[in-house]
């Protein structure tokens, strides 16, 4: 059964030209963390995986930087950048867990982050 | 160099057995995981079997649950294919094939052909 | 399981030429798709990965594009060495699926 839930930090924005942090933390289950696949929308950012480290996909290389620990950092924001990102922990023996984050690129100066949130 | 060598086809009576090894060297075998895809003469490519670096993830086609039986041996740098109940439908070039991330077959062995017939 | 459905099957085409070859799926599949070149009597070989990415070593005129259902691999400027059957395929959930192929042949 999975017991797992991932937290992650929501809703967030950030204003266009800066950078964010995209972070997801999976808890409350034992099962080992054999991957996490980063995602936009349609589009695989990046895998970081147990074994075989970080890899960014080239298309995203100038603009993504792994870490800190399981999470991504984006660089040279843009409007464009706006949207849903996926945090996908393939785990062993609990299975697949899939944490949302919705960044919101502002052209002002007015972004502030969202509060933290929970998905079962 | 990566390199997968895939041994142990041939011709073999239906309803009988064959063991399939590929011999991997030139990377971290333990690291990755590594499946089996075969083609039959002429057709198109159809993925077999799958098992995750440390073995505790592994899947198989529909076609061959119950019958093949996929491990490896990271001391060895070898990954098996157990064949069992083989059928006329089985006949095929069977690849070996490394799987970064899960994600895409970025080697393949040079293949070797199994032929069920009688 | 995902069908990966391939067009087309075949085609004619001179050197020079600029191909396009299409791959859809069943469902949704993000960017988890790969193409493969595979020649007569040798193993496949990877082209592109996660729809658009180019595979160490592969030349510049091979480009990927797609997501979601529907992807694309254009040869840009069609080679000699390019006659070969093209596959997709797809890595989103298991069982891995591949498209039926599609064979480039010299017009």
């Known amino acids: 059964m999975m017991t797992g839930t991932i937290e992650t930090t929501g809703n967030i924005s950030a204003e266009k030209g800066g950078s964010i942090i995209l972070q997801c933390h999976l808890s409350s289950t034992t099962a080992q963390v054999t991957q996490v696949n980063w995602e936009q929308q349609d589009q695989l950012l990046a895998i970081c995986n147990a074994d075989l480290g970080w890899h960014i996909s080239p298309s995203f290389k100038d603009r993504v930087a792994p870490g800190p620990g399981l999470g991504l950092t984006l660089q040279s924001l843009t409007v464009n950048d706006t949207g849903e990102y996926f945090c996908i922990y393939h785990t062993y023996p609990d299975g697949t867990y899939t944490g949302r984050i919705f960044l919101e690129v502002l052209e002002s100066s007015v972004a502030e982050h969202g509060a933290r949130f929970q998905i079962p | 160099e990566v390199q997968l060598l895939e041994s142990g086809g041939g011709l073999v009576q239906p309803g009988g057995s064959l063991r399939l090894s590929c011999a991997a060297s030139?990377?971290?075998?333990?690291?990755?995981?590594m499946h089996w895809v075969r083609q039959a003469p002429g057709k198109g490519l159809e993925w077999v079997a799958a098992i995750s670096s440390n073995t505790g993830s592994i899947g198989y086609a529909d076609s061959v649950k119950g019958r093949f039986t996929i491990s490896r041996d990271n001391s060895k740098n070898t990954l098996y294919l157990q064949m069992n109940s083989l059928r006329a439908e089985d006949t095929a070039v069977y690849y070996c094939a490394r799987v970064p991330y899960d994600v895409w077959i970025d080697y393949w062995g040079q293949g070797t052909l199994v032929t069920v017939s009688s | 399981d995902i069908q990966m459905t391939q067009s087309p099957s075949s085609l004619s085409a001179s050197v020079g030429d600029r191909v396009t070859i299409t791959c859809r799926a069943s469902?949704?599949?993000?960017?988890?798709l790969n193409w493969y070149q595979q020649k007569p009597g040798k193993a496949p070989k990877l082209l592109i990965y996660?729809?658009?990415s180019l595979q160490s070593g592969v030349p510049s005129r091979f480009s990927g594009s797609g997501s979601g259902t529907d992807f694309t691999l254009t040869i840009s400027s069609l080679q000699p060495e390019d006659f070969a059957t093209y596959y997709c395929?797809?890595?989103?959930?298991?069982?891995?699926?591949f498209g039926g192929g599609t064979k480039v042949e010299i017009k």
């Open positions: 395929q797809q890595s989103y959930s298991t069982p891995l699926t």
């Open positions: 469902q949704s599949i993000s960017s988890y």
């Open positions: 996660a729809a658009s």
């Open positions: 030139g990377f971290t075998f333990s690291s990755y995981s």
